[in-house]
């Protein structure tokens, strides 16, 4: 058992049929010695008397808010939450496995540049009685500071009969060094509490591995005189790290015919312009990736050829 | 380069960009294969890293590129020795068309561009002996290549910036 916050405790339980559970001793926070009784949640049923109450916590029915009273007056409270461990693995019932980039991915994180700022998000089908807290650091044995903002409900989607909620948080490394080679990973820890169930989720990554640039901007087409060719140009996204001579991007460009089945010609270039044949009803697209490290490609930026 | 002369920025840029390509073809990203384990904070200390105070940022390069270039060269020699060690030459054997050989030669080539004959900078101690089990060796290869990818990315940025802004 450990204290999550004042008067709120997490009981770690091995979860299997007929498990013995954990013995927990609750102490009433009062100088009084006599006439103390204990109740659980809103039930008026007296569970025991005396300054301490010993309980065997085996299931969710044993968790909840315990109150000690004297003469009809509440003296102190303790809230017990459960953290389940099944077959040696902590439960992950609250958040949804996003399965990207691999199974058991509950937290996903992305960065638009090397500034030390990143966003993490997670999914759940649970709407009410759900709370989160987030902590982050660089490294774990001698952690360096990372400051996370508020968790916000960033999207709601209907998936069949279920509603899915996406929560996200933005964090910023306190002393980021964009040009250095990261030695220790960023750690992100999310505590999730649903009713009386406590769970924690972690993700560990280097910023370089979660980079996903914004799409190139100001995508423009300029027809060349007396030719079927057009000159296309684009710019680095505003959110990308500067100077661009140091933080360089590479680009993938393609012309896509009206039919999705039509063969797409893809060309890779480090330049911010190209000459292509752009037929009527086709569209031109460009995406960006860090030039020197194979992290994610940006989403496509597109313009119609006509 | 030693003694304050400028490197052949454009040549270094080309070779470092080639190194990036080779490092990724030697160990492509296998679904974000997570090679970090407990205690990794300690094992990552074995390899040289380009750190914040090494002057490899744009401002540091403008002020005095020598500190950064020396750091890069130390790293190149370190990785070149690793790729030539029995971690890579022992079992399991590399495939005949493995890019590791080219990567090894390119590391040597770039380190020589940064230090012509006759100059010797101190280099970092070569790493501890290779593990005995083939599977351990294979895992160590992956870790070394992942670490090398990060190192050469920073080096390539340095040379690209140098070629664009510091070339005579």
């Amino acid at each position: 058992i450990w204290e999550l916050k004042k008067d709120v405790y997490v009981v770690e339980l091995d979860w299997y049929p007929d498990a013995p559970g954990e013995m927990v001793v609750l102490t009433c926070d009062t100088p009084e010695e006599d006439g103390i009784t204990w109740t659980l949640d809103q039930s008026g049923e007296v569970l025991g008397s005396g300054k301490t109450l010993t309980i065997q916590v085996k299931e969710f029915g044993d968790a909840g808010q315990y109150t000690c009273h004297k003469g009809g007056e509440a003296l102190s409270h303790s809230l017990l939450l459960l953290h389940k461990k099944e077959d040696g693995i902590w439960s992950t019932d609250v958040l949804k496995d996003q399965k990207e980039p691999k199974n058991k991915t509950f937290l996903r994180c992305e960065a638009k540049n090397y500034s030390g700022r990143f966003t993490c998000w997670w999914l759940t089908t649970i709407s009410t009685d759900l709370t989160f807290s987030v902590k982050s650091s660089r490294g774990s044995s001698n952690p360096q500071g990372v400051t996370c903002g508020a968790v916000t409900l960033s999207a709601e989607r209907v998936r069949g009969d279920n509603k899915e909620y996406e929560y996200s948080v933005e964090c910023q490394e306190d002393s980021a060094c964009p040009a250095a080679e990261e030695r220790l990973p960023i750690e992100v820890m999310v505590d999730a509490i649903h009713k009386l169930k406590y769970e924690n989720y972690t993700s560990s990554f280097f910023i370089r591995d979660i980079i996903k640039p914004d799409p190139p901007k100001n995508l423009q087409l300029k027809p060349l005189k007396n030719s079927r060719q057009v000159e296309v140009s684009w710019e680095y996204p505003d959110t990308w790290s500067t100077p661009h001579s140091y933080f360089s991007l590479t680009f993938c460009i393609q012309v896509q015919g009206k039919s999705k089945r039509e063969k797409k010609d893809r060309i890779f270039t480090d330049k911010t312009s190209a000459t292509v044949i752009c037929r009527k009803n086709a569209s031109f697209s460009v995406q960006a990736q860090d030039r020197y490290y194979s992290s994610s490609w940006s989403e496509w930026a597109s313009v119609p050829c006509s | 380069v030693p003694g304050g002369s400028s490197p052949a920025w454009a040549q270094c840029q080309q070779l470092s960009q080639k190194l990036c390509t080779l490092a990724w073809s030697a160990h492509p990203l296998v679904g974000h294969m997570d090679l970090r384990e407990e205690g990794d904070e300690e094992t990552t200390n074995d390899v040289p890293h380009i750190q914040c105070g090494d002057g490899c940022d744009p401002q540091g390069l403008r002020d005095n590129s020598q500190f950064c270039l020396q750091r890069i060269r130390q790293g190149l020699i370190f990785y070149e020795k690793l790729l030539g060690s029995d971690i890579f030459t022992g079992e399991p054997s590399l495939l005949p068309d493995s890019p590791v050989g080219q990567l090894h030669a390119s590391l040597l080539g770039l380190s020589q561009l940064l230090q012509p004959e006759g100059h010797h900078w101190e280099t970092q101690q070569i790493p501890s002996p290779s593990p005995s089990q083939p599977w351990q060796r294979l895992l160590l290869r992956f870790k070394i290549l992942r670490s090398l990818q990060a190192f050469v990315a920073v080096a390539a940025r340095v040379f690209a910036h140098g070629a664009a802004t510091l070339s005579p």
Partner: nanobody, 125 residues
Framework: EVQLVESGGRLVQAGGSLRLSCAAS????????MGWFRQAPGKKREFVAI????????NYANSVKGRFTISRDNAKNTIYLQMNSLKPEDTAVYYC??????????????????WGQGTQVTVSS
């Protein structure tokens, strides 16, 4: 210093309506769940209603569902409790609570970090 100040409580006839307000100062709670709890004489403090940071998710105690509505105005850093079809058993001191956590909030009062002084609601038959 964080302060939550409730207002709007008074004596009202059964079947009547009231609107409680809770204004927060000292910090913004626009991303945090806030809620209402109540305590009748000689009884435990009980959960009434909670609302998520953006106001999109609400949760009510069964005893008030369909009669009470919780809402918030983040620009004013204020939450409200519209109470309709009041019953004598709704008589209690109503407390506003704010959490330092995120999400849709908890029905347990110990999960809240900031509390108001309370406003008295008395429903006469």
């Amino acid at each position: 210093e964080v302060q939550l100040v409730e207002s709007g409580g008074r004596l009202v006839q059964a079947g009547g309506s009231l609107r409680l307000s809770c204004a927060a100062s000292g910090r913004t709670f626009d991303s945090n769940p806030m809620g209402w709890f109540r305590q009748a004489p000689g009884k435990k403090r009980e959960f009434v209603a909670i609302i998520s940071g953006n106001g999109g998710i609400t949760n009510y105690a069964n005893s008030v569902k369909g009669r009470f509505t919780i809402s918030r105005d983040n620009a004013k850093n204020t939450i409200y409790l519209q109470m309709n079809s009041l019953k004598p058993e709704d008589t209690a001191v109503y407390y506003c609570a704010a959490s330092g956590l995120y999400g849709s909030g908890s029905v347990y009062d110990l999960m809240y970090d900031y509390w108001g002084q309370g406003t008295q609601v008395t429903v006469s038959s």
